[in-house]
Interface confidence: low
């Protein structure tokens, strides 16, 4: 006869491991007992359990409640055992020694491999600001056995670097994602992807990028100067900018205080019916925690009578 087993049994942490040991005997052969032991190199054999054809299952105190026979129906030639709730310390070499008659004793070894799935964590880097050089966007760490694979999934252009720390029964892998911050990255997802044989599917942790910036300011509303004439109603100037965090707006007049009746409503400066007093240099000041910008425009309120007089002069001059 001969023993049938597996070279390696792989189980995920917390699952039950079946340690196979089946005697493929000739007709009439019987199994008297099956002795299981842990036989790690450099250490003496540690008794695990004894399956006796007459006296049943005996379990070492160190494994009490954790070693069982597979559920019935059982083949008397099957010396397999179940190791419940596998922990990392169970990883190692095991030996089953089968005593048969009349053929004698047989033994086989297997290696129990306990996969420890990682619990990844993602840590954002320092605040990202447009204009910075290569900056840490995030780091992702996962520890497991065997060492997990840590990669990144993103549309953002960047560079990655990884390092590994090896412990007695596991390895921690840390991957860093560096980028040169730009406003186009704002709101873009940066996903850490952790792969491991103990995981049914990759684990993913997503970090949304926030890049501080402030765009140049400009003022809209003066595109047609001819509309800025005495008596016009509803005239307004609008300050254009964008930023992260969203900017605040402030309006001032360079050559004096804002005229009475002028309304400041965030990015918009609203005028009452225009008079020549509204002529002047207006400044839009845009700021956020990152930066500040200014844009100024000159408002020249036209007097239609003056303008028409000038036109008559021009005509008569011709």
């Amino acid at each position: 006869g001969e023993l049938e087993t597996s070279d390696v049994v792989t189980v995920v942490l917390g699952q039950d491991a079946k340690l196979p040991c089946f005697y493929r005997g000739d007709s009439g052969e019987q199994v008297g007992q099956v002795a299981w032991a842990r036989v790690d190199a450099g250490e003496g054999a540690q008794e695990l359990a004894l399956l006796h054809s007459k006296y049943g299952l005996h379990v070492s105190p160190a494994y009490e409640g954790r070693v069982e026979q597979p559920p019935p129906p059982r083949n008397p030639l099957d010396g397999s055992v179940l190791l419940r709730n596998a922990v990392q310390a169970d990883e190692g070499e095991y030996e089953c020694r089968v005593s048969t008659f009349p053929a004698g004793s047989f033994q086989a070894r297997l290696r129990l491999r306990v996969l420890v799935p990682p619990l990844p964590s993602l840590n954002p880097g320092p605040a990202l600001e447009e204009g910075q050089g290569l900056t840490l966007a995030a780091s992702c760490t996962a520890e497991g056995s065997p060492a997990p694979s840590v990669t990144w999934d993103t549309e953002v252009k960047g560079t990655t670097s990884s390092r590994s720390f090896k412990h007695s029964r596991s390895a921690a892998v840390t991957s860093e994602f560096h980028l040169v911050p730009s406003r186009s990255m704002n709101g873009q997802p940066l996903t850490c992807v952790v792969s491991h044989p103990g995981l049914l599917q990759d684990q993913r942790i997503t970090h949304i990028l926030h890049v501080s910036f402030l765009a140049e300011a400009s003022v809209r509303g003066l595109e047609d100067q001819n509309l800025w004439h005495i008596g016009r109603e509803g005239a307004m100037l609008k300050c254009l900018s964008e930023g992260q965090p969203p900017p605040s707006y402030n309006w001032t007049r360079l050559d004096g205080p804002l005229p009475s009746g002028v309304r400041v409503d965030g990015d918009t400066l609203g005028f009452p019916p225009l008079t020549t007093e509204h002529s002047g240099i207006y400044v839009c000041h845009v700021s956020n925690e990152f930066s500040s910008r200014d844009s100024q425009v000159t408002v020249d309120v036209l007097d239609p009578q003056e303008d028409s007089g000038k036109q008559v002069d021009l005509v008569s001059a011709s």
């Epitope: 070499e93 491999r113 044989p197």
Partner: nanobody
Framework: EVQLLESGGGLVQPGGSLRLSCAAS????????MGWYRQAPGKEREGVSS????????RYADSVKGRFTISRDNSKNTLYLQMNSLKPEDTAVYYC??????????????WGQGTQVTVSS
């Protein structure tokens, strides 16, 4: 005992191709991730490519992306590296590598003896 045996190296002209093989034994081949490293004269050993136990996940150094392809045949316990569009800077000794955890030992890294790849006209 973990054993790794590389083959397939040789002398090839720039632009040519080679296929390296690594026969493995002594560990759970279909579970363990494996990789190829290389060491050029006077330089440190550097990672070239790696592959998961299932073969579904691969990774490449920037210098070989689009030119090298890693694969494995778990039924034959063999790891491969297909190298196309070879350049003189690819000249190095190429090593097969795996990381195996056994019992209480810290024996993570196992290496083969290496196979020489020389790219020259």
């Amino acid at each position: 005992e973990v054993q790794l045996l590389e083959s397939g190296g040789g002398l090839v002209q720039p632009g040519g191709s080679l296929r390296l093989s690594c026969a493995a034994s002594g560990f759970a081949f279909s579970i363990d991730a494996m990789g190829w490293y290389r060491q050029a004269p006077g330089k440190e050993r550097e990672g070239v490519s790696s592959i998961s136990g299932s073969g579904g996940l691969t990774r490449y150094a920037d210098s070989v992306k689009g030119r090298f392809t890693i694969s494995r045949d778990n039924s034959k316990n063999t790891l491969y590296l297909q190298m196309n569009s070879l350049k003189p800077e690819d000249t190095a000794v190429y090593y097969c590598d795996t990381a195996v955890l056994t019992g209480y030992s810290e024996a993570f890294d196992y290496w083969g003896q290496g196979t020489q790849v020389t790219v020259s006209s």
